[in-house]
């Protein structure tokens, strides 16, 4: 659909004479008739295919042609049209004499005809106007011509229809040959599609406008790149939606089990060495001079009774020092100068001369130690007992009263409540400080999991289009991770599709 | 007095070149297409060629196409018809003719003889 | 290319008596056809124009009609001068092509 439009410039009649060549009375009162059709091979008369136009008297003789398309008149004139423009033409272009007011052809008597011009012609939609002149003996009319297309029209003979939105169904301007240019932000072949926030993941992000990024179930983050992991997820994270991986040190389905409890706890004080035992219990190795579960005790360095053959320990700031009874000597006494003559071994030990009789050795009796028998034995001394277990002298032996959750004859053995497989239905079962705990699977409940509740929510299969269905099972529901182009809760609704359009 | 006076006819080998002049006079020229229509001995009437009245288009019969050339120097009345590469079927009487039937325009000339041959 | 087909190629007629020649198209040429005569040594004459007008200056007694692919040349009283080659020439799309003719001939 189109428009020709003919803008005429300038007539000379000089002469003012009919094309008879009678002279008009008083003179030629002049309006122009058009015809345009179809391209003929000769120009020949016959139906005016594509249009005709008339104007008003113009004007007498000669005289020039106001242009007037500014005020809504009729230069230049139009010829519309609602076909492909074919690029060629014939317009056929006749100037008449009215004698009274009534232009109509049937009033008119056929000599009132002062000229005529009939051309066969090329023209290009879009190109500027293109200037003729036709001359005869008695008249000269200089004309012009072009053609344009009409509103929403386009292309090279205006065929393509394209009208500018910004709607539900388009977000688009017409280019000069009719094609779509989106307007900033859209995309597609009719600019339907947003252009996502830059940088929202193309799986597991989606928007509705532009520059926006909204996340599919079990996705997070202003780019849609984060999962979600599984609700009540403690300490670990996920690579796919609703997982809960464990972080170094922790376990259990929630990751809320501290299996390294030395790091986290750091409980072992005054340097002490911390080594993890099992579920949140740890044992300290204490450095000299410490002691206590967490080798929180400072020890005296008297306290490991350094001193022998009866001397005494006196406690100073860098260490300490024996003062030796008489007939020994050396930093810890350890030298005599008594012989089996002088009876230095007590508590019934035995004495053995050494060296030719220049020293001599106890053999002590159980329970007693020490270079001369002197010391009874303290057993728990080395502090044999682990896991923070209390040592007990009990006469001639000694015993080792355990923390909870430890047995053995040095508290060596973790006691594991879980050895009897407690928990039912295939539950998970966690060993604790007091007790146990059982996690138990989709559709169990209760301390050992004996009391069925549901069934997995993702047994029925619930969702469309190949998404991927994950039970949550704080809640015993479903959520389904749409593949990329659907939505809805189950996945159930294609997006970005185009509708169809009207046209 | 109408007169349409074709000129540069004559004798010429295969493969040669000729060029055809058609003078007007008496009326106006450059208001009308312009066209060359052939007559080969014992044969009918037969269009080479069209140039229209400002020389925008130009048409030409599909033997000659590549070959002949139309053209007008609406300045000097005169149409042209340029023809290379001439073949023995080009032999013909070579009329121009100016034909408007909406305006009752039909103007002949009287032919100029192009013969091709070796 | 629309092609044109004349009939009869010889027609023998009296003179003062009525010839009819037809001239048929391969398609519709919308009325955009012309009849010549030609004579020997002479260029064509047109005579009738967009299937029915009559040129001007050229007698009455010549007439044609037609539309769509059939057109007709009428002669109504044939004179001595109008034995000639007679031939129709269709102006609606190039390539332009003509008639065979039709030899008219005093019988």
């Known amino acids: 659909s189109g428009v020709f439009q003919l803008q005429l410039q300038e007539f000379i009649n000089e002469r003012g004479v009919l094309a008879s060549g009678r002279p008009c009375e008083p003179g030629c009162r002049t309006f122009f008739r058009v015809c345009l059709k179809h391209f003929q091979a000769v120009v020949s008369p016959g139906p005016c295919t594509f249009g005709t136009v008339s104007t008003p008297v113009l004007g007498t003789n000669s005289f020039a042609v106001r242009d007037d398309s500014s005020g809504g008149g009729r230069n230049p004139l139009q010829l519309p049209f609602n076909f492909t423009w074919p690029g060629t033409f014939s317009l056929i272009i006749e100037a008449w004499h009215a004698p009274g007011d009534d232009l109509r052809p049937e009033a008119l008597p056929p000599d009132a005809l002062i000229s005529k011009i009939a051309i066969q012609g090329s023209l290009a939609v879009g190109q500027n106007w293109l200037l003729d002149e036709q001359t005869s003996t008695l008249t000269r009319l200089r004309y012009s011509y072009r053609v344009i297309c009409s509103d929403n029209y386009y292309g090279d003979n205006c065929s393509r229809l394209c009208k500018k939105r910004n709607d539900h169904f388009g977000h688009y301007v017409c280019q000069p040959d009719g094609n779509l240019s989106c307007l900033p932000g859209w995309t597609g072949e009719y600019c339907q599609q947003p252009i996502c926030l830059s940088g929202c993941h193309e799986q597991n992000g989606y928007c509705s406008k532009p520059a926006e990024c909204l996340c599919r179930p079990g996705w997070q983050g202003r780019l849609c790149n984060e999962c979600i992991p599984h609700n009540g997820c403690r300490h670990g994270t996920c690579s796919t939606p609703w997982q809960c991986t464990c972080d170094e040190g922790w376990g259990g389905l929630f990751c809320d089990q501290d299996l390294n409890y030395c790091t986290h706890h750091s409980p072992c004080k005054n340097g002490a060495t911390c080594s993890n035992s099992g579920q949140r219990s740890y044992t300290c190795t204490c450095r000299p001079g410490y002691t206590g579960v967490d080798c929180e005790l400072e020890l005296s360095e008297c306290d490991s009774n350094p001193c022998r053959n009866g001397g005494s320990c006196k406690d100073q700031e860098d260490g300490y020092h024996c003062l030796c009874p008489p007939g020994y000597y050396g930093l810890h006494c350890e030298h005599s100068t008594l012989s089996c003559a002088d009876s230095p071994c007590f508590n019934g030990g035995s004495c053995r001369e050494r060296n030719q009789g220049a020293n001599y050795a106890c053999e002590c009796p159980p329970n007693f130690t020490g270079s001369n028998c002197e010391k009874k034995v303290d057993r728990c001394t080395s502090n044999p007992c682990a896991n923070g277990g209390q040592c007990l002298n009990r006469g001639p032996s000694r015993m080792c009263r355990c923390r909870p959750g430890f047995t053995g004859t040095y508290c060596e053995l973790h006691v594991s409540d879980c050895a009897r497989n407690p928990c039912a239905h295939g539950g998970t079962c966690h060993d604790l400080e007091n007790g146990l705990m059982c996690t138990c699977p989709a559709g169990f409940s209760g301390r050992r999991c004996e009391v069925r509740t549901s069934i997995d929510a993702c047994a029925s299969s619930p969702c469309f289009n190949r998404a991927t269905c994950y039970t949550d099972l704080s809640t015993d529901t479903f959520v389904c991770n749409c593949p990329y182009g659907f939505v809805g809760s189950r996945c159930e609704f294609p997006v970005g599709l185009p509708p169809s359009f009207p046209w | 007095e109408v007169q349409l006076v074709e000129s540069g006819g004559g004798l010429v080998q295969p493969g040669g070149s000729l060029r055809l002049s058609c003078a007007a006079s008496?009326?106006?020229?450059?208001?009308?297409?312009m066209y060359w229509i052939r007559q080969a001995p014992g044969k009918g009437l037969e269009w080479v060629a069209f140039?229209?009245?400002?020389?925008?288009?130009?048409y030409y019969r599909d033997s000659v196409k590549g070959r002949f050339t139309i053209s007008r120097d609406n300045s000097k009345s005169t149409l042209y018809l340029q023809m290379n590469s001439l073949r023995a079927e080009d032999t013909a009487v070579y009329h121009c003719?100016?034909?408007?039937?909406?305006?009752?325009?039909?103007?002949w000339g009287q032919g100029t003889m192009v013969t091709v041959s070796s | 290319e629309i092609v044109m087909t004349q009939s009869p190629a010889t027609l023998s007629v009296s003179p003062g008596e009525r010839a009819t020649l037809s001239c048929r198209a391969s398609e519709d040429i919308y009325s955009n056809l012309a009849w010549y005569q030609k004579k020997p040594g002479q260029s064509p004459r047109l005579l009738i124009y967009?299937?029915?007008r009559l040129q001007d200056g050229v007698p009455a007694r010549f007439s044609g009609s037609g539309s769509g692919t059939e057109y007709t040349l009428t002669i109504s009283s044939l004179q001595s001068e109008d034995f000639a080659v007679y031939f129709c020439?269709?102006?609606?799309?190039?390539?332009?092509?003509f008639g065979q003719g039709t030899k008219l001939e005093i019988k």
């Open positions: 967009a299937a029915n």
């Open positions: 003719a100016a034909l408007n039937w909406e305006l009752g325009i039909d103007y």
């Open positions: 140039i229209s009245h400002g020389g925008g288009i130009t």
């Open positions: 008496g009326f106006t020229f450059s208001n009308y297409g």
């Open positions: 020439l269709q102006g609606s799309k190039f390539p332009l092509t």
